[in-house]
Interface confidence: medium
């Protein structure tokens, strides 16, 4: 059955982030009320035109490649960029649009038969055999500056919290990072015991809102170290 009859708050369609933080595998993440549970099989977020974060070319569309948006930019921040057309500069094959490849730093036509095998290999490297669906991709133009400056709404794909609208932060949700609500008083939060542990979460929570801090819930003081529940509390 398709459990997609939802009200307008699009984040409710996201896969339920239960088990959320690495430090609290048993506690529910209150991203939004009414989140769907497995049984139905489709969940969809709101449409958005935020820069799409990526770690490698295969995570982008067929007409895109993964790179830092600025020349010599932060290597840790990469997004899907529109592919380079023929005669444009390139550093690797993936930068060139379909039907082209990178030769001596320039995108050239790959009409030559000897290159076909390499293109096929790149396509099948993607998860799923895309041969049947490649035709379904429409041509995409480069990102306009408007796309970069639109603040993401709840559920929008993001790179960092500054990409999100007020009251939202950028946090991981399964594989991607999306805009989620900043936590309110009383909501469960994640207290990171060691530096860098935030990156281990598959479903990250936002941080606590202004005037709040993430502390052990009073009635959980007696609980064992691993099961202590943290909530957003007034300073």
């Amino acid at each position: 059955t398709l459990n997609s009859v939802l009200n307008s708050n699009a984040i409710k369609n996201l896969p339920p982030p239960l088990g959320g933080a690495a430090g609290h595998p048993g506690s529910a993440v209150s991203a939004a009320p009414g989140i769907l549970y497995p049984g139905g099989n489709k969940y969809q977020t709101i449409d958005n035109y935020q820069p799409y974060p990526c770690a490698e070319d295969e995570e982008c569309g067929t007409d895109e490649y993964c790179a830092s948006p600025t020349r010599g930019g932060d290597a840790g921040v990469q997004i899907c960029l529109a592919c380079r057309k023929r005669r444009k500069r390139c550093m690797r094959h993936a930068m060139c649009c379909p039907g082209n490849y990178c030769k001596n730093g320039i995108c050239v036509s790959s009409d030559q038969n000897h290159f076909r095998g390499e293109i096929e290999e790149t396509i099948t490297e993607s998860f799923g055999n895309d041969h049947s669906t490649l035709d379904g991709y429409s041509r995409r133009t480069t990102l306009s500056s408007k796309m970069y400056h639109t603040k993401g709404q709840e559920g929008s794909v993001c790179l960092r919290s500054s990409d999100c609208a007020s009251g939202l932060c950028c946090a991981r949700h399964f594989w991607s990072k999306i805009c989620k609500p900043v936590l309110k008083e009383g909501q469960v939060c994640t207290k990171h015991r060691r530096k860098g542990s935030h990156g281990l979460e598959i479903f990250q929570r936002c941080y606590c809102g202004e005037g709040l801090s993430c502390r052990i819930q009073k009635d959980h003081h007696q609980a064992s170290n691993s099961s202590r529940l943290h909530t957003c509390q007034r300073h």
Epitope: Y43, P51, A55, G61, F127, G128, T133, F174
Partner: nanobody, 124 residues
Framework: EVQLVESGGGLVQPGGSLRLSCAAS????????MGWFRQAPGKEREFVAA????????RYADSVKGRFTISADNSKNTAYLQMNSLKPEDTAVYYC?????????????????WGQGTLVTVSS
């Protein structure tokens, strides 16, 4: 319509192994990642493992690291979860999930699809 069908669940003794499969059909978009989640009786559902589309990047829950291995067969649109050194606490319904781009652009809405689950029971 996209369908994810899990198989490979069953009864196994502690210390034993099982291999779960998740076959995807009706795909008209490109996956970004596939993963496994599980829900034990009376407990919240939890993340187990995930693999990105190219298969080069994987993530695991701390509780299964070193015991479970996620992999994917591109040609069959199938993801696998090899579960070794199983413990009674691994008993749960295991769900397959997929995160995908829209069919025309990765900036389209992200789409999430779920399977119906397969039961894994670890008991002597």
């Amino acid at each position: 319509e996209v369908q994810l069908v899990e198989s490979g669940g069953g009864l196994v003794q502690p210390g034993g192994s099982l291999r779960l499969s998740c076959a995807a059909s009706g795909i008209t978009f490109r996956f970004k990642a596939m993963g496994w989640f599980r829900q034990a009786p009376g407990k919240e559902r939890e993340f187990v493992a995930a693999i990105n589309r190219s298969g080069r990047s994987t993530r695991y829950a701390d509780s299964v690291k070193g015991r479970f291995t996620i992999s994917a067969d591109n040609s069959k649109n199938t993801a696998y979860l090899q579960m070794n050194s199983l413990k009674p606490e691994d008993t749960a319904v295991y769900y397959c999930a997929a995160e995908s781009h829209g069919s025309t652009s990765p900036r389209n809405p992200l789409q999430y699809d779920w399977g119906q689950g397969t039961l894994v029971t670890v008991s002597s």
